[in-house]
Interface confidence: low
């Protein structure tokens, strides 16, 4: 069986002092001891904890330790449980408090000849006894005009008069100790006939067109008079208002209301109270019109990582003084830390890349709010993503040199060629990412290239050597269509260059071999005597080991070159008559005839009714006019060659016939008459 050797007993305890509830048990087996407070298990804390089987209190608490404690012993094997006798504390305490006005409800209601009751808020157990003091002097019960109720802790003054004015305090003592009031009460009872300030007007700042209210109250017995004056000593009443105070109202309680305030209403307002006796009391208050100016613009700022920078926000002029604060990403900045607000300054200490962004300075007062953004960029030294590499670039193709860097702000990349700055032109282009493009690589582009990437934080540079790989190419490329004159000797050249000297050979496009009278001599195709069969498609092939081969296709045409069978002659024609300019050409392929008159080609489709070109090539001009005079060129051409011949055309006035001349006498020059 479980037996309690020591049981807890009820006892006196002092607030905040140590205490111990003893409990000792004896049992055949191991037992588990715990405590109950009002039937609920007691949890260990630093203040109250199990000490062996007993319960120890480091500091008794009158609130947490009130109730019934019980010690419980339990055998966890058998389930047997025994409970001690109940024990509780009689906790002694005393606690200071203020002296407060119990009656009347507020200080404003304290009038001469009224009853005033003060209460001493010192409490304790056992109930303490109280002592009252006025200006440090003890008040004994039963003195004139006051009574002390210890039970109620009250001091009653009846009736209260000016002689009761002073500072009231109280002290209390009990078996536990002593305490005095933590806050004292000043009682002030003045001469009733003097005007006394109940409510003084305060300076007011209002936004334009808003309303302003000045409160002013005096008290006296009999009641005092109250008058409002504006700056120029003009009285303000509901019956007589100055012109600039048309919207002023004086309320019965003395308050002055100004509506739709304008700049001219700003100034000093005086409230004057006069009692039956004593001097007038003059109270002043100023009406200010709220205003806020615009804020100056911020220049964008570029800072370097790791540095400390400050951005000052000059608050706009305003009344009341605008309050200033900084925000970033919609969040107000703190007043300490790495990025913080100090006074009107934005401070960025040990700047990080992540600090970049838009910071906003706000300024606000009654007149409104202003804000101004500053864009902060954190510059970093560029770092390499891809340096320019020594490169072998192929001639004739685009060549690229990388200069890929990253930084904030976006780095500026410039390129140098043989230490000379490259300016962008038709051959060079620098992409946004810094890559240099050489649009068509030339042999002389084989040189040093250096790129420099810069930000305000610094720059990096790297260089690369470019070697140009000369392409295998025809020099010059053979003309794709060529003509050979029938029955004559002809040569068709073909030459090429490359990294290695190429070998050049000709072959027929159909793969057939060249006839014996056609020779291929170091790239030159030689025809000893051109035949019709030599016409056709030929291929020039240039090849070397490292670069393979290239081909140029040439279509050879065998032609009988153009000759004129009939050429136009110098011709004179009378005005209004018809001119005929003859021209006939032969060749193979059959040539086409075109005419050029007065330096322009005569388009057969646009000649008009006066001109016509015949199928055989002759040009006829009807109803010739003086402006038709000039040189006319006959152009004969086919796919192989072009020949031209020209003759002048003269247009003259027809002479009036004379009697002496016989009808058969010819003119002195060749004449066409129609």
């Amino acid at each position: 069986a479980i037996v309690f050797i020591k049981q807890p007993s009820s006892q006196d305890a002092l607030q905040g002092r140590r205490a111990l509830l003893r409990c000792e048990v004896e049992a055949p087996g191991p037992v588990h001891v715990y405590w109950l407070l009002d039937g609920a298990p007691v949890q260990d804390t630093e203040r109250r904890f199990a000490q062996g089987s007993s319960l120890s209190f480091a500091a008794v608490d009158r609130l947490q330790d009130s109730g019934t404690f019980q010690c419980v012993a339990r055998d966890d094997v058998t389930g047997e449980e025994a409970r001690s006798a109940n024990a509780s504390f009689n906790i002694k305490w005393i606690e200071a408090g203020p002296v407060v006005l119990k009656h009347p409800a507020s200080e404003a209601e304290i009038q001469p000849q009224t009853q005033v009751t003060l209460r001493c808020h010192i409490d304790g157990h056992p109930r303490p006894t109280y002592q009252w003091f006025r200006d440090g002097t003890p008040l004994s019960d039963g003195q004139s005009n006051h009574t002390v109720s210890s039970k109620e802790r009250n001091l009653t003054l009846r009736p209260a008069g000016p002689e009761h004015s002073g500072l009231y305090s109280c002290c209390a003592h009990s078996a536990f100790g002593q305490a005095c009031s933590s806050q004292n009460f000043t009682l002030s009872i003045a001469d009733e006939s003097f005007a006394r300030v109940v409510l003084a007007p305060q300076d007011v700042v209002v936004a334009r067109y808003e309303e302003a209210m000045f409160h002013c109250q005096f008290s006296a017995q009999p009641p005092p008079s109250l008058q409002w004056l504006f700056e120029d000593e003009t009285p303000i009443t509901n019956r007589s208002r100055p012109p600039h105070l048309r919207r002023a109202t004086v309320f019965a309680n003395g308050s002055l209301l100004l509506t739709q305030v304008r700049p001219r209403n700003a100034g000093i307002y005086r409230c004057i109270g006069q009692g039956q006796r004593g001097p007038p009391i003059i109270l002043e208050a100023t009406l200010h019109l709220a205003e806020i100016e615009d804020m100056p613009l911020f220049e964008p700022r570029v800072f370097t990582a790791g540095s400390e920078e400050r951005v000052t926000c000059l608050p706009p002029k305003g009344l009341p003084e605008p309050s200033v604060w900084w925000e970033h990403a919609g969040v107000r900045l703190p007043t300490h830390g790495r990025v913080y607000q100090k006074g009107h300054e934005l401070v960025l200490a040990n700047i990080a890349e992540s600090d970049a962004g838009v910071y906003t300075c706000h300024a606000a007062n009654l007149a409104g709010q202003r804000r101004q953004d500053v864009n902060i960029t954190v510059a970093t030294v560029p770092s390499w993503l891809k340096k320019p590499q020594d490169s072998q670039l192929e001639e004739g193709k685009p060549g690229y040199l990388d200069c890929l860097t990253q930084a904030t702000p976006k780095p500026t990349v410039v390129w140098y060629r043989n230490q000379m700055l490259i300016s962008e032109d038709s051959r060079f282009e620098v992409f946004k990412n810094g890559t240099l493009r050489i649009n068509s690589v030339e042999v002389y582009d084989g040189t040093w290239y250096r790129c420099m990437s810069s930000t305000p934080a610094g720059s990096i540079e790297a260089q690369a050597r470019v070697q140009v790989l000369e392409k295998l190419k025809f020099t010059p490329p053979p003309q794709p269509q060529q003509c050979m004159e029938f029955d004559k000797e002809a040569t068709v050249p073909c030459s090429a260059t490359g990294r290695e000297k190429p070998t050049i050979k000709w072959e027929r496009a159909d793969g057939s071999s060249l006839p014996e009278w056609v020779t291929d001599n170091a790239g030159t195709l030689h025809f000893a005597r051109v035949t019709r069969d030599d016409a056709g498609n030929y291929t020039c092939i240039a090849s070397n080991g490292p670069q393979g081969q290239i081909r140029a296709h040439v279509q050879l045409t065998v032609a009988v070159f153009i000759t004129f069978k009939v050429e136009p002659e110098r011709t004179t024609v009378y005005q209004g008559h018809t001119a005929l300019l003859q021209c006939e050409a032969q060749g193979d392929p059959k040539p086409l005839i075109q005419w050029k008159g007065k330096d322009r080609i005569l388009d057969p489709t646009k000649l008009g009714p006066r001109m016509h070109i015949f199928q055989n090539g002759s040009l006829v001009i009807h109803d010739v006019a003086p402006e038709d005079s000039g040189r006319y060129t006959c152009i004969a051409g086919n796919s192989c060659n072009i020949k031209h011949t020209e003759a002048p055309l003269y247009v003259v006035d027809k002479p009036v016939p004379e009697e002496s001349e016989g009808p058969g006498s010819p003119p002195p020059y060749k004449m066409i008459q129609t």
Epitope: W384, K387, D390
Partner: antibody
Framework: EVQLVESGGGLVQPGGSLRLSCAAS????????MHWVRQPTGKGLEWVSS???????NYPGSVKGRFTISRENAKNSLYLQMNSLRAGDTAVYYC??????????WGRGTLVTVSS | DIQMTQSPSSLSASVGDRVTITCRAS??????LNWYQQRPGKVPKLLIN???SLQSGVPSRFSGRGSGTDFTLTIGSLQPEDFATYYC?????????FGGGTKVEIK
Amino acid sequence: EVQLVESGGGLVQPGGSLRLSCAASGFTFSSYDMHWVRQPTGKGLEWVSSIGTAGNTNYPGSVKGRFTISRENAKNSLYLQMNSLRAGDTAVYYCARWVNWYFGLWGRGTLVTVSS
Amino acid sequence: DIQMTQSPSSLSASVGDRVTITCRASQSISNFLNWYQQRPGKVPKLLINAASSLQSGVPSRFSGRGSGTDFTLTIGSLQPEDFATYYCQQSYITPLTFGGGTKVEIK
């Protein structure tokens, strides 16, 4: 002390793989192009591969497609992954720092033997 | 690839001798040529870079000349510690190539 120390060499069968490492110390590893050079016993030097600071790589035809060079700047380390090894790859492999067109710093080398 | 041909492949000389080693490139490499010394069991050591620029700490008896395809390394007065194998190397273009080496032995 500025130095390069190779490791990872050993005996491997033809067709096998091996990964060589080179630990750099005493200098800013990430700022330099790094190379591997090999030397068959009693023979001359042969360039094997290079890696630039931006990670760009280069190989001669004899190892292209079989060897891969890489670097880990945070660990100041250079690597050479060798696959499809042949008897002709037997050599002492040096890692070397490349600057201004020359090998200015060499490691002590690690021996790779390819044999069945 | 650029072939680098070194000659002679070996030579015997005495202390105090003037020794010249030649290196020929299969194509012009401008002055992108380096010379290395390798003593037995040791790692290569840079002597000269850019054909003629003596590396810091290398004795002045070593000198280099040449440009284009023909280059020479000269040891003005051979010292005992100079007996080693010497390699030329072009750095003009990848693949980087070395000469076959010249072994300088004691006569």
